[in-house]
Interface confidence: low
Amino acid sequence: LEVQVPEDPVVALVGTDATLCCSFSPEPGFSLAQLNLIWQLTDTKQLVHSFAEGQDQGSAYANRTALFPDLLAQGNASLRLQRVRVADEGSFTCFVSIRDFGSAAVSLQVAAPYSKPSMTLEPNKDLRPGDTVTITCSSYRGYPEAEVFWQDGQGVPLTGNVTTSQMANEQGLFDVHSVLRVVLGANGTYSCLVRNPVLQQDAHGSVTITGQPMTFP
């Protein structure tokens, strides 16, 4: 029995619902009484949802899963996962048994966009060319871990003296803090770009230092 799932991971935003597609080709005369369907976590083999003996056996996964019962007879064994969390990320296997048996695994990639970075400067007054300043770029509640890039006003990448830390909160979302230590020129703009590698979403923050005063666009 051939079971088909998408090759590419299903990308779902945290808090939204995701559909993990799975289909099979029922033979003529097929009835749901013959169907055994199991969704499980590929790695741990934990049962997620099942259909057997003509009945939806329900969710074994925090009551957040559902089948499409009206579509099962047409060979649609897809699973709906509600209120996606970071912890849901991973591989789900769809097992279908009628007379023959088949299975396939689909990957769920969870994502959350990063907030617009906030920029802080230390010290933040009486700045002179030649002073060393610390610029902190903070962006919150994204997933997965971000890629952080710094550049100057001319678009030249700044890679030295950058320290980036990322810490997950209890939902598994990351807060990113990137610190750039730089020696001030006569004036300058420093930009931080926080990229979500899955969503290919960029969040920008910048600070312009003009001797005095400073501006935060």
């Epitope: 741990t44 997950a168 803090h177």
Partner: antibody, heavy 118, light 107 residues
């Protein structure tokens, strides 16, 4: 070297409050969560709660809500836990521990022994 | 809350032996499980996190395995310094909870 230095042992009377401290050195306090863990004599470990020093967000184990109050003083790189309305059940060693990215604990303080006795 | 059970409460083994300590979770914690050793009068020391990852400085004779609800910590070639209490801790969601501990004694 990353270290957490906790305040010394205390003996307090029932009904009183106590505030114990945990000074971080070798790293910046605000870069990591600070967690607190209770261990009663001869017993296992119980997570009390944690504080994110960057945003002062606090998560308590429901069991310790109303019993423990977590605070930080970023200027001195020090975290505090205040325990109130103490009873003999609160007699224990209290550890501070640095909450790593994945929420396990790599760096621990030596523990503060709190004894509640009249 | 997720309960972690560590049978047995104590075990003893001889130097050079291989010892396995187990931990069972009341619900799926995926691979979010850490192991600690606590020597008498000392703070706990992290041995394993994410079920099988050893932090820097932990001897390679320690190894962790398991996922979901069943986990184990294996100590190859037991040394005298390995005596103490061993605790598992899940780091899947708050409240983080610890197992009741397994006391390892050296014969």
């Amino acid at each position: 070297e990353v270290k957490l230095v906790e305040s010394g042992a205390v003996l307090v009377k029932p009904g009183a409050s106590v505030k114990i401290s945990c000074k971080a050195s070798g790293y910046t306090l605000s870069d990591f969560n600070m967690d607190w863990v209770k261990q009663s004599q001869g017993k296992s470990l119980e997570w009390v709660g944690d504080i994110n020093p960057n945003y002062d967000t606090i998560t308590y184990n429901q069991k310790f809500r109303g019993k423990a109050t977590l605070t930080v003083d970023r200027s001195s790189n020090t975290a505090y836990m205040e325990l109130r309305s103490l009873t003999s059940e609160d007699s224990a060693v209290y550890y501070c521990a640095r909450g790593e990215l994945g929420r396990y604990f790599y760096v621990w303080g030596a523990g503060t022994t709190v004894t509640v006795s009249s | 809350d997720i309960q972690l059970t560590q049978p047995p409460a104590s075990l003893s083994a001889s130097v050079g032996e291989t010892v396995t300590i187990t931990c069972r979770a009341s619900e799926n914690v995926y691979s979010y499980l850490a192991w600690y050793r606590q020597k008498q009068g000392r703070s706990p020391q992290l041995l394993v996190y994410n079920a099988k990852t050893l932090p820097e400085g932990v001897p390679s004779r320690f190894s962790g395995s398991g996922s979901g609800t069943q986990f184990s910590l294996k100590i190859n070639s037991l040394q005298t310094e390995d005596l103490g209490d061993y605790y598992c801790q899940h780091h899947y969601g708050t409240p983080w909870t610890f197992g009741g501990g397994t006391k390892l004694e050296i014969k």
